[in-house]
């Protein structure tokens, strides 16, 4: 997250970190069910761990943390690497979470976002771009949903209805390491960090997010079919 600020503790209990060995964060994710996460499909890896209820990026033990293995990864069937359409994936955890103030699911919004909607994006991604700089703790950033026309103008021929753009003033954006993390609008999960300009946070180049309102049926049916 570029030019965000430290999230208040306990305010993002659905935020997950996907870790490669040894405790190397590579993507964010979102708890949407006691045993299921949503993340970006481009975050797919064979072997990874999931950390929930953790505030700092470092692997130091926190009393609220819960660790899991991802036992099943189900990318959306319309996703094709390395494209960005249909960029979402469900991950089944090896067990159900223990609900606490630090770990609980969020509902996926069934309403598509309208321009001007205020949202919050969070993650442990780099705080500088194009060089990489790790934050100490989870970062939060207020962003506004842009109209689909402004989105398409910013990224000609790259935007479809499985994406939406959101941003703020130049110099504020999601970035590397935030992929798969949540965009929360009006208390519901509206999007996942997917892509954006390179380097991040360029003027008139908003972040691009997976438009989850288009996928509520697939999410529900996939969880039911694999539970």
């Amino acid at each position: 997250i570029i030019n965000g600020s430290d999230c208040d503790m306990h305010t993002q209990p659905w935020q997950a970190a996907l870790l490669l060995r040894p405790n190397q964060l590579y993507c964010g994710a979102v708890l949407v069910h006691p045993q299921w996460l949503l993340t970006a499909a481009h975050c797919r890896k064979k072997v990874f761990r999931v950390r929930l209820g953790h505030y700092s990026l470092s692997p130091v033990y926190e009393s609220g943390q819960q660790m899991f293995q991802g036992v099943k990864s189900i990318p959306h069937p319309g996703y094709s690497h390395p494209g960005h359409s249909n960029d979402l994936m469900l991950i089944k955890l090896n067990r159900r979470i223990r609900p606490t103030k630090d770990v609980r699911p969020i509902n996926v919004s069934s309403h598509c976002p309208s321009a001007g909607t205020k949202c919050l994006v969070s993650g442990w991604g780099t705080t500088k771009s194009p060089q990489v700089h790790f934050p100490k703790v989870l970062q939060c950033l207020n962003i506004s949903v842009l109209s689909q026309k402004r989105c398409e103008d910013a990224y000609p021929r790259q935007i479809d209805d499985t994406m939406f753009c959101a941003g703020d003033k130049a110099g504020r954006d999601s970035c590397q390491g935030d992929s798969g993390g949540p965009v929360v609008c009006n208390g519901s999960l509206q999007g996942l960090v997917s892509w954006g300009d390179y380097p991040c946070a360029r003027p008139n180049r908003p972040g691009v997010y997976t438009n989850l309102c288009k996928f509520t049926k697939w999410i529900q049916e996939t969880i039911q079919a694999n539970s």
Epitope: L25, Y26, Q131, V132, Y155, C175, S179, W195, Y198, R202
Partner: antibody, heavy 124, light 107 residues
């Protein structure tokens, strides 16, 4: 299958501007999934990264070359270009263009497709 | 600027032997941002390993990468005749840079 082909003059005079073009075939530059790079290799030496460009035109340059480098993209021609000003004999090298994958995960996918390289000699 | 130092400069080995190449960074580099390339005379570099340990498409499993922080290693478990080449590490954590290379030559 994606292919990259560098082209441009093989001989440039000192103090002039070196101009090279990389033509992409079998794939499209206007893709949000990739960035495009220039790398060079002086005779008998190692590789030096020059800079990257995204399809949108956003660039990222090697700090040591930044004052002399311009990388641009022409999506209609499926090409990207390098200009290096005020060249000296030290800029004599094989110049490569390459492609790298890009997303917002904490991950560097490496540069997976390279051109065969073009030799540029700086001499009067 | 992160400087990558590769050692040894030259490695003289016979086919079938194991090759261990080192890449040391002047400051800590996320392992996710480290790649290895192979270059043969007159050819462009070829991506072998990305993310310090993941093999690129079509790369044989005798090539493996490991390491974290400032120390990274490329291992070729059993050298084949076509493996004799120059190998470069690259980091993209800071402004991208390459190591000076290690030449693997036939003993």
């Amino acid at each position: 299958q994606l292919q990259l082909q560098e082209s441009g003059p093989g001989l440039v005079k000192p103090s002039e501007t070196l101009s090279l073009t990389c033509t992409v075939s079998g794939g499209s530059i206007p893709s949000s999934s990739y960035y495009w790079s220039w790398i060079r290799q002086p005779p008998g030496k190692g590789l030096e990264w020059i800079g990257n460009i995204y399809y949108s035109g956003s660039t990222y340059y090697n700090p040591s070359l930044k004052s002399r480098v311009t990388i641009s993209v022409d999506t209609s021609k499926n090409q990207f270009s390098l200009k290096l000003s005020s060249v000296t004999a030290a800029d004599t090298a094989v110049y490569y263009c390459a492609r790298g994958e890009y997303d917002r995960s904490y991950y560097f996918w490496g540069m997976d497709v390279w051109g065969q390289g073009t030799t540029v000699t700086v001499s009067s | 600027e992160i400087v990558l130092t590769q050692s040894p400069g030259t490695l003289s080995l016979s086919p079938g032997e194991r090759a261990t190449l080192s890449c040391r960074a002047s400051q800590s580099v996320s392992s996710s941002y480290l790649a290895w390339y192979q270059q043969k005379p007159g050819q462009a570099p070829r991506l072998l390993i990305y993310g310090a340990s993941s093999r690129a498409t079509g790369i044989p499993d005798r090539f493996s990468g490991s390491g974290s922080g400032t120390d990274f290693t490329l291992t070729i478990s059993r050298l084949e005749p076509e493996d004799f080449a120059v190998y470069y590490c690259q980091q993209a954590f800071s402004s991208p840079s390459f190591g000076g290379g290690t030449k693997v030559e036939i003993k």
